[in-house]
């Protein structure tokens, strides 16, 4: 992996037809920011600028618009917004920021509403959206941000909306709030400084008794020579009802702790960008996967990391010691006093005494931090969003698969082997304009990931098995969704009956898997070609033998017969071999890839001259052959001949 982090094995450029993708866009619509999957997995609800859409995603291909309802900010609010020096072109609109499934018949949506947040219930009829009635629009302060650029998060739990956003026009008043449902509305307290003014929320994840909020903010507990940002997890109890007078309508169970995502001895990745929960059969082993960047640009480039945090570790830190602020010195130190009962954040049902509440309001910062396991560290890339799922390999083993959206509009598919660092199966450049990925939504039933952009939504099938044309390539890819079917001789998506299929997730070693098994024949260092391309030399012309680089992880060399052609040789240019017809030029040329300790011919050419045909090596007698034309350059200047087949670069 080197200092750069793992390289994607395969890279698809924007518009590359080898990666099956489809793009939904709608004339006049922009900012497809908020994505919600219906319970049955067949409809994708989308919050865009001034509109909510229902897309049918049941069938492969481009999502089909079921219907769309407009929800523009009122003219009065737009006028007020412009009067307050905000832009009519980019800001004074209703950007949908919250879209959750409230019950079987209603969605709940909130938007910026031209810097005057608003929320509404949207009725569903057979998964179609019914129009929004103006008199049903409510104040959305504390649920949606005012400014579309402000980060925010919201999650609906037991009919209550837990939201983290900016609560004022200036964007200097962060708030964690609970609304809807029968419980009292609760929020964070301004004066108690539970949140720094620049707190930026990225995720809200419910657990058994609590809801966790993930955010970043300026750190107040460290003396640092520059402003230091820090990532946090906060918790509030679902059964919190606020205080009777002290902390009335305020959280009485708010606690926060530092999240640490760092490689040993390195500066931490201190800015959290997104987090998701991957549930496990037992909640205690469930893990939260989070994407981080760093405020420090090492070597002038942005870098990102994905860390995993166990719920058990988070719970343990919240059960540990507190920090407290010494107001005389403005220093945070470990609290060493006696415990109060009930303990802050313990979610005990009884009413809290004023003494306990007084303690709570000042003891909200935990002493220990939650340490994450770095799974992927990559420089030169800024991850913005992630989606995570578990995939079962052929052998029944479970693999964590992460889909990572970047700030330049690409999607990385990463696989985390058990107790090991992640590797990148592929990188897909979705946006031709390098626009950032705004949101990701996994649709497991459809076997796809949906990526929201400013201009539309990409549907990305979770795997692209058919691109691996040989057993070797299929196995080396180590994509848990793909395996080699020896019968059809295709790399295919894993499905029900796959007994004789081939896959090696642990080692990615085709040496055993792609032969008939370990007992069949002694392992060979290099596999034989699957196809030989026959090429005729043309007098006074340079032959160009292309070599498709199927994997960025392989090293490539050319061989002639049994001899390796030196890399320094001027005959290799951009991976292609250039041949000038002369005596001894004929015979077998192979472009050989070496990956994961295994060598295999990517392409094999038999070069023949019209006047001196060569007898084919008897060892290659059973290998199928195909006559091809390759690009030629006439010596002394002349046009290149187009190849009959294109050799696409990854």
């Amino acid at each position: 992996t080197g200092g750069q982090g793992p390289m994607p094995r395969v890279k698809y450029h924007a518009g590359d037809g080898h990666r099956a993708l489809s793009f939904f866009q709608q004339k006049g619509l922009r900012d497809f920011d908020t994505l919600l999957l219906s319970d049955d997995g067949n409809t994708l609800y989308v919050g865009a600028r001034e509109a909510v859409l229902a897309l049918n995603i049941q069938n492969p291909g481009i999502p089909r618009l079921k219907n769309m309802i407009p929800w523009p900010a009122s003219e009065r609010k737009k006028t007020e917004c412009a009067f307050k020096k905000k832009s009519n072109e980019t800001q004074c609109f209703n950007f949908i920021r919250v879209l959750v499934s409230y019950n079987a018949t209603h969605l709940y949506a909130c938007g910026t509403f031209a810097f005057s947040p608003a929320c509404t219930f949207i009725e569903l009829q057979d998964s179609l959206l019914l129009p929004i009635l103006i008199d049903k629009v409510m104040d959305g302060k504390g649920q949606s941000p005012f400014d579309p650029v402000h980060k925010h998060t919201a999650v609906l739990v037991d009919g209550m909306l837990y939201s983290g956003t900016m609560n004022n026009f200036l964007g200097s008043e962060p708030i964690l709030m609970r609304t809807l449902g029968s419980q009292p509305v609760l929020k964070t307290d301004i004066f108690l400084r539970w949140l720094h003014a620049d707190a930026s929320f990225v995720a809200a994840i419910p657990s058994t008794q609590v809801v966790y909020f993930f955010f970043e903010e300026t750190a107040s507990e460290f003396d640092f020579f520059e402003e230091l940002y820090i990532s946090r997890v906060a918790q509030v109890c679902k059964n919190d009802v606020g205080g009777e007078k002290l902390l009335q309508k305020k959280w009485t169970t708010f606690l926060k702790a530092q999240l640490l995502c760092a490689q040993p001895g390195q500066l931490p990745f201190n800015i959290i960008r997104h987090a998701v929960l991957l549930p496990a059969d037992s909640p205690s082993v469930s893990r939260i996967y989070a994407v981080f960047t760093s405020q420090w640009q090492v070597g002038g480039t942005r870098s990102s990391a994905v860390c995993a945090f166990s719920l058990t570790d988070i719970e343990r830190v919240f059960k540990g010691k507190y920090k407290e602020l010494n107001k005389e010195t403005s220093r945070w130190t470990t609290y060493r006093g006696s415990e109060v009962s009930p303990r802050p954040g313990s979610c005990s049902m009884g009413p809290s005494s004023d003494k306990a509440l007084t303690f709570m309001k000042d003891h909200f910062l935990m002493d220990e931090h939650v340490v994450g396991t770095p799974l992927l560290v990559k420089s030169g890339v800024e991850y913005t969003r992630l989606a995570v799922e578990s995939a079962r390999g052929l052998d029944g083993s479970s693999h964590v698969v992460m889909y990572l959206g970047t700030s330049t509009g690409s999607l990385h598919k990463a696989v985390v082997p058990q107790d090991s660092s992640a590797y990148l199966v592929e990188e897909i450049q979705l946006s031709p304009d390098s626009e950032p990925v705004r949101n990701l939504q996994l649709a497991p039933a459809q076997g796809a990931v949906f990526a929201g952009f400013s201009g539309g939504i990409w549907r990305v099938p979770r795997a692209n098995c058919s691109v691996y044309e040989s057993c070797v390539d299929c196995v080396l890819a180590r994509d848990p969704h793909c395996a080699w079917d020896p019968e059809s001789r295709l790399c295919s998506l894993l499905s029900g009956s796959t007994k004789p299929w081939k896959q090696d997730m642990e080692r990615g070693n085709p040496e055993w898997v792609c032969t008939r098994g370990p007992m069949a024949r002694s392992p060979r260092r290099q596999s034989p070609p699957q196809l030989i391309k026959e090429v005729l030399t043309v007098p006074n012309s340079i032959l160009e033998l292309p070599c498709p680089h199927l994997s960025a992880l392989a090293s490539y060399h050319w061989s002639h017969g049994r001899a390796k052609i030196s890399e320094a040789s001027a005959t290799v240019y951009n991976g292609s071999l250039l041949l000038l017809p002369q005596d001894g030029v004929g015979g077998l040329y192979q472009c050989v890839a070496t990956e994961n300790g295994y060598s295999y011919p990517v392409v094999s050419y038999w070069v023949d001259s019209q006047d001196q045909p060569l007898a084919l090596d008897p060892e290659l007698a059973g290998v199928p052959r195909e006559r091809v034309q390759v690009p030629l350059t006439r010596v002394g200047g002349g046009a290149s001949m187009a190849a009959q087949r294109s050799y696409w670069p990854h």
Epitope: S172, F191, H196, K245, L246, K249, K327, S330, D354
Partner: antibody, heavy 121, light 111 residues
Framework: QVQLVQSGAEVKKPGESLKISCKGS????????VGWVRQMPGKGLEWMGI????????RYGPSFQGQVTISADKSINTAYLQWNSLKASDTATYYC??????????????WGRGTMVTVSS | SYELTQPPSVSESPGRTVTISCSGS????????VHWYQQRPGSAPTTVIY?????PSGVPDRFSGSIDSSSNSASLTISGLKTEDEADYYC??????????FGGGTKLTVL
């Protein structure tokens, strides 16, 4: 002892800018909110906003957002209230006050003596 | 927006007891703490009661505060009135957005 010392009276013309100050002493200035309160001639007290000098986190009352700027310089234990373009209606006495810890919550426990600002053409 | 209403003026003779009320416009006044400030003519305000009924040190025990949930109002009571008590008195609480709100003030005249 704990005290807040405010800058002296100002006479200004409409359209001019102004920055008045409030210097804290006798306590850890960075650990307490400082609020600003307006009192127009013969009228009551109006809450303008607050600042936490430790990190300059400022919050404004609804009527004053966008009208004034509250800032602080923690290195010299001073909070400021600033106008970019004064109006005649800004004529008032401006008090700074510390938001102190009660047993349970906050109240304005220490007040400055006030700065009289007169805006007249 | 949340408002606190006080009587514009009250007057009483020295040695007597006076009560100044402060009522909230919406919701229960008891749900938030109420503080009271005294402002003598030409001076800055000072705190006489905080958190409904707490007295800062140095404030005589003639000053007391209370909350009456039935009338949804807070009260400042001054017993044994002295001429030096002549001042404007302001109640203060917080609205739903944690903004401080002052009552309009009550002018106390000691006859």
């Amino acid at each position: 002892q704990v005290q807040l010392v405010q800058s002296g009276a100002e006479v200004k013309k409409p359209g001019e800018s102004l920055k008045i100050s409030c210097k804290g002493s006798g306590y850890s200035f960075t650990s307490y909110w400082v609020g600003w309160v307006r009192q127009m001639p013969g009228k009551g007290l109006e809450w303008m906003g607050i600042i936490y000098p430790g990190d300059s986190d400022a919050r404004y009352g609804p009527s004053f957002q966008g009208q004034v700027t509250i800032s602080a310089d923690k290195s010299i234990n001073t909070a400021y209230l600033q106008w970019n373009s004064l109006k005649a209606s800004d004529t008032a006495t401006y008090y700074c006050a510390r938001l102190g810890d009660g047993a349970y919550y906050y109240y304005l426990d220490v007040w400055g003596r006030g700065t009289m600002v007169t805006v007249s053409s | 927006s949340y408002e606190l209403t006080q009587p514009p003026s009250v007057s009483e003779s020295p040695g007597r007891t006076v009560t100044i009320s402060c009522s909230g416009s919406s919701g229960s006044i008891a749900s938030n703490f109420v503080h009271w400030y005294q402002q003598r003519p030409g001076s800055a305000p000072t705190t006489v009661i905080y958190e409904d009924d707490q007295r800062p040190s140095g404030v005589p025990d003639r000053f007391s505060g209370s909350i009456d949930s039935s009338s949804n109002s807070a009260s400042l009571t001054i017993s044994g009135l002295k001429t030096e008590d002549e001042a404007d008195y302001y109640c203060q609480s917080y609205d739903n957005n944690d903004h401080a709100v002052f009552g309009g003030g009550t002018k106390l005249t000691v006859l």
